[in-house]
């Protein structure tokens, strides 16, 4: 709490400007009227106040708006946003994408803080879904944003928003998240032709089922090893040697370097050694010739 002291003669602020830059904590408290501050919030950003001074200004706004700031003030908070707590932000009703952008700009270059996470959560919940413009904005500021959402939250992303997603936005997504995003991407890109479709869908393939991988193998896509290594193991296992060869094209030679890593290792264990030998890569560990493979999981399903 700042002590209530009278404003020194001649120091009363008539407007929010650079003359306040070196005011002491108590001088700001005594000499700046909260209503004036609220109406001239857009000027605060241009003045290089210290964190301590921003604390005083925040305290003034809190007294003026105990139930939460109006959006007209929020939009112009600028660096004052750095002083807001998640509790403060939960009182807000932010509906404008421009307001969201303005506040994210202040935090640009920094990791996502609890304040930013709360702001985004409030904004998205207010909109009801993660629309394309919002997703565009959020991933521009935080490339990893999409992968920070739970599968349940991702389910509210409309397929049309998937067009805003860049490959790097999915770098930290786990298989559960890609399971949700892949069908949306498939739907979003369904009208594209073969090669263009593959370029767009490639980043999402960690959520693709076996049938889709089989279909891609018929399209000469030449999937790179990095993408192949991110595929779901359970989706890769049923693929035949011929299908994997077609899927990878010239990149098939890379299997040798990855033979001890999943999903390649597990896939090798499911293939006949004869079939693996046809690749000429020296892959070892397949099912020896003459052995019968029983798929017990299929038997259980039938019974």
């Amino acid at each position: 709490e700042v002590e209530k002291t009278a404003c020194p003669s001649g120091k009363k602020a008539r407007e929010i400007d650079e003359s306040l830059i070196f005011y002491k904590k108590w001088e700001l408290e005594a000499c700046v009227d909260a209503a004036l501050l609220a109406t001239q919030m857009d000027r605060v950003n241009a003045i290089p106040f210290t964190y301590e001074q921003l604390d005083v200004l925040k305290h003034k706004l809190d007294e003026l708006y105990p139930q939460g700031y109006p959006e007209s003030v929020i939009q112009h908070l600028g660096y004052l946003f750095l002083k807001m707590s998640p509790e403060d932000i939960r009182k807000w009703n932010v509906t404008s994408l421009e307001t969201l952008k303005a506040l994210l700009e202040v935090n640009k270059g920094h990791e996502m803080s609890p304040q930013v996470a709360t702001l985004i959560d409030r904004f998205v919940k207010g909109r009801g879904q993660l629309d394309k413009d919002t997703l565009d904005t959020l991933t521009a500021f935080y490339p990893g944003y999409l992968c920070s959402l739970s599968p349940e939250e991702l389910s509210s992303v409309p397929p049309s928003s998937i067009w805003a997603v860049r490959p790097q936005d999915l770098d930290t997504c786990d298989p559960r998240q890609l399971d949700v995003l892949y069908p949306k991407a498939r739907l979003a890109f369904q009208n594209m032709n073969g090669s263009e479709y593959f370029v767009k869908i490639q980043s999402f393939l960690g959520g693709a089922p076996t049938e889709d991988l089989k279909a891609l193998s018929q399209q000469n896509v030449s999937m790179d090893l990095a993408t192949f290594m991110k595929l779901r193991t359970d989706a890769v296992l049923p693929l035949t040697v011929a299908e994997v060869q077609k899927l990878l094209g010239p990149h098939v030679e890379g299997l040798k370097a990855e033979e001890r890593h999943r999903p390649v290792r597990d896939w090798i264990l499911r293939q006949r050694q004869d079939d693996l030998d046809t690749l000429g890569l020296g892959l070892q560990g397949g099912i020896p010739n003459g052995y019968l493979v029983l798929d017990l999981s299929m038997q259980e399903a039938l019974s």
């Epitope: 650079e18 904590k25 290089p48 964190y51």
Partner: antibody
Framework: EVQLLESGGGLVQPGGSLRLSCAAS????????MSWVRQAPGKGLEWVSA????????YYADSVKGRFTISRDNSKNTLYLQMNSLRAEDTAVYYC???????????????WGRGTLVTVSS | IQLTQSPSSLSASVGDRVTITCRAS??????LAWYQQKPGKAPKLLIY???SLESGVPSRFSGSGSGTDFTLTISSLQPEDFATYYC?????????FGGGTKVEIK
């Protein structure tokens, strides 16, 4: 090239005066608050004074208040420090320094001059 | 706000991991910067906002901390890193610097 160049240092007797200058180039000088920071021989850094971009607001450390005056001429891209009633303890290298950003609470310095030595001695 | 740096000096070898601490007399959130100064030269900004690396500064330098306790770490000391390091708070006026830590060759 972005740089700051101080001048005006030298030997002065106690009670005397000196005016330091700092010529700025390579950035929009008038957009940035500027500071003077000093360093006594073999000692640490001490923030002495600061001035807003327009020159309308100033700040002084208690140790120099009433004796030093900071000013700027934006048309000449130059920062000044007028030092009066100098004392032996004012002996130091004086650096002019540019604030990191034009706005925001970022009061640290990303550009420094090479410094000018002020020696107060009889 | 007073900043206390420790140690005031240390001896280390090339390749060593070096840690310097800075303690503030009151909480300053993450409003702390670190500088490197070599003899006869001006200070050079290394870290701001306690942990953000200034552009062009090698990634072997890192900063951490919040509130009152802060750390500057050099993960693998290089010959050019032998210098004096200062912390500076910018939470409020007057801006203040720590007393410095001199890193010398062992």
């Amino acid at each position: 090239e972005v740089q700051l160049l101080e001048s005006g240092g030298g030997l002065v007797q106690p009670g005397g005066s000196l005016r330091l200058s700092c010529a700025a180039s390579g950035f929009t000088f008038s957009s940035y608050a500027m500071s003077w920071v000093r360093q006594a021989p073999g000692k640490g850094l001490e923030w002495v004074s600061a001035i807003s971009g327009s020159g309308g607001s100033t700040y002084y450390a208690d140790s120099v208040k009433g004796r030093f005056t900071i000013s700027r001429d934006n048309s000449k891209n130059t920062l000044y420090l007028q030092m009066n009633s100098l004392r032996a303890e004012d002996t130091a290298v004086y650096y002019c320094a540019k604030r990191w950003g034009k706005d925001g609470p970022y009061w640290y310095f990303d550009l420094w001059g090479r410094g000018t030595l002020v020696t107060v001695s009889s | 706000i007073q900043l206390t740096q420790s140690p005031s000096s240390l001896s280390a070898s090339v390749g060593d991991r070096v840690t310097i601490t800075c303690r503030a007399s009151q909480g300053i959130s993450s409003a702390l910067a670190w500088y490197q100064q070599k003899p006869g030269k001006a200070p050079k900004l290394l870290i701001y906002d306690a942990s953000s690396l200034e552009s062009g500064v090698p990634s072997r330098f890192s900063g951490s901390g919040s509130g009152t306790d802060f750390t500057l770490t050099i993960s693998s000391l290089q010959p050019e890193d032998f210098a004096t390091y200062y912390c500076q708070q910018f939470n409020n006026y007057p801006l203040t610097f720590g007393g410095g830590t001199k890193v010398e060759i062992k």
